[in-house]
Amino acid sequence: PKQTLPKPIIRAESTYMVPKEKQATLCCQGSYGAVEYQLHFEGSLFAVERPKPPERINGVKFHIPDMNSRKAGRYSCIYRVGELWSERSDLLDLVVTEMYDTPTLSVHPGPEVTSGEKVTFYCRLDTATSMFLLLKEGRSRDVQRSYGKVQAEFPMGPVTTAHRGSYRCFGSYNNYAWSFPSEPVKLLVTGDIENTSLAPTDPTFPDSWDTCLLTRETGLQKDLALWDHTAQNLLR
């Protein structure tokens, strides 16, 4: 069987949700010594990067200028060491935002609730769309989808203090083209014991971890690579 190198890790720098006309940056983390990295978009070659010097860098950044709906979709990357190619990375969904209009997000029965209350978010957008998305800040990978002509409901069921935080919604024109984000709605949840509402806390794995952890080879190289691999596993 044909030998391949381990698959690289593909990530979006800062966020996978990129406002239209802004620059997206994708990182492909392979291995030291890789002489070429290829970025594929929807299965076809999109860009090539050659690190300099290859033996000192464990990945590359691909800059995608002027983001638009034609550049939004599924990306993957591969790398080459000598004549040997890697397996393809996992797919990364790159989304363009700030398309068309801004939805309004509201919450029932209100933004301040008691643990155990049934909470529903409502996202409304008057322009034609059928899919709506609800995201919690710091948890932008955990997208909830709902459908409706003008408005969609997101029933959260009986909430706990884990639901507290700031939420935004988007209207979606397709899987990769989203509206402007709504204004945030901060959900405050009071627990069963304490009598004060708890403000949102920092998420365990905030979005700031979605950053390009590319390293230059040093004495710490092995430790950094190990830490980075562990972090990625935690994120997944």
Epitope: T104, S106, H108, G110, P111, E112, V113, G116, E117, R124
Partner: antibody, heavy 117, light 107 residues
Framework: QVQLVQSGAEVKKPGASVKVSCKAS????????MHWVKQAPGQGLEWIGE????????NYNEKFKRRATMTVDKSISTAYMELSRLRSDDTAVYYC??????????WGQGTLVTVSS | DIQMTQSPSSLSASVGDRVTITCRAS??????LNWFQQKPGKAPKLLIY???RLHSGVPSRFSGSGSGTDYTFTISSLQPEDIATYFC?????????FGGGTKLEIK
């Protein structure tokens, strides 16, 4: 401070309609659902419904669904409750109220609607 | 709709007395039970939410307890200014429903 100021008392004939207003101030009007509650003379409290000023979404008590209409005018932070085809048993004080924290914690002063021929 | 049955419908007590009002729901309201005070010609005022939590500014002589379908409201030491009608209200399911009220008078 939070205030809900309702329109004045009304006297209406059976079959007519009445529209009660509730002007909100001291909080973000579009964030909190506005509730309407009926209290007939010497009687208990009955929930009519609620409206989301942010998007106009409503929930009605089935009992009032056919005759009550709740609306808002965001530009002046005012909610309205219109009751049509009035009958004598609609004679009551009508309250608007909001749930700022965990229950209906702010109420308007009430609007007395008298239905009499 | 959930029916809320409040008792007694009226009661007379002396200043300093301990006063208890009960409220029974036709089904479990999961502690989402609130108590309101209403004085003549005034709007209802929230006293207690979520069975036992005191709304801000409410004196500590007011308290609430209960679970499931049975709930109790207590005034530990009745004061003259407590003369009013008291309502329970469930907030577990739409539509919210109120008890019939308890009119409290001074002996």
């Amino acid at each position: 401070q939070v205030q809900l100021v309702q329109s004045g008392a009304e006297v209406k004939k059976p079959g007519a309609s009445v529209k009660v207003s509730c002007k909100a101030s001291g909080y973000t009007f579009t964030t909190y659902w506005m509730h309407w509650v009926k209290q007939a003379p010497g009687q208990g409290l009955e929930w009519i419904g609620e409206i989301n000023p942010g998007n106009g979404g409503t929930n009605y008590n089935e009992k009032f669904k056919r005759r009550a209409t709740m609306t808002v005018d965001k530009s002046i932070s005012t909610a309205y409750m219109e009751l049509s085809r009035l009958r004598s048993d609609d004679t009551a004080v009508y309250y608007c109220a909001i749930r700022l924290r965990f229950a209906l914690d702010y109420w308007g002063q009430g609007t007395l609607v008298t239905v009499s021929s | 709709d959930i029916q809320m049955t409040q008792s007694p419908s009226s009661l007379s007590a002396s200043v300093g007395d301990r006063v208890t009002i009960t409220c029974r729901a036709s089904q479990d309201v999961r502690n989402f039970l609130n108590w309101f005070q209403q004085k003549p010609g005034k709007a209802p005022k929230l006293l207690i939410y979520f069975t036992s939590r005191l709304h801000s500014g409410v004196p500590s002589r007011f308290s609430g307890s209960g679970s499931g379908t049975d709930y109790t409201f207590t005034i530990s030491s009745l004061q003259p200014e407590d003369i009013a009608t008291y309502f329970c209200q469930q907030g577990n399911t739409l539509p919210p429903t109120f008890g019939g009220g308890t009119k409290l008078e001074i002996k």
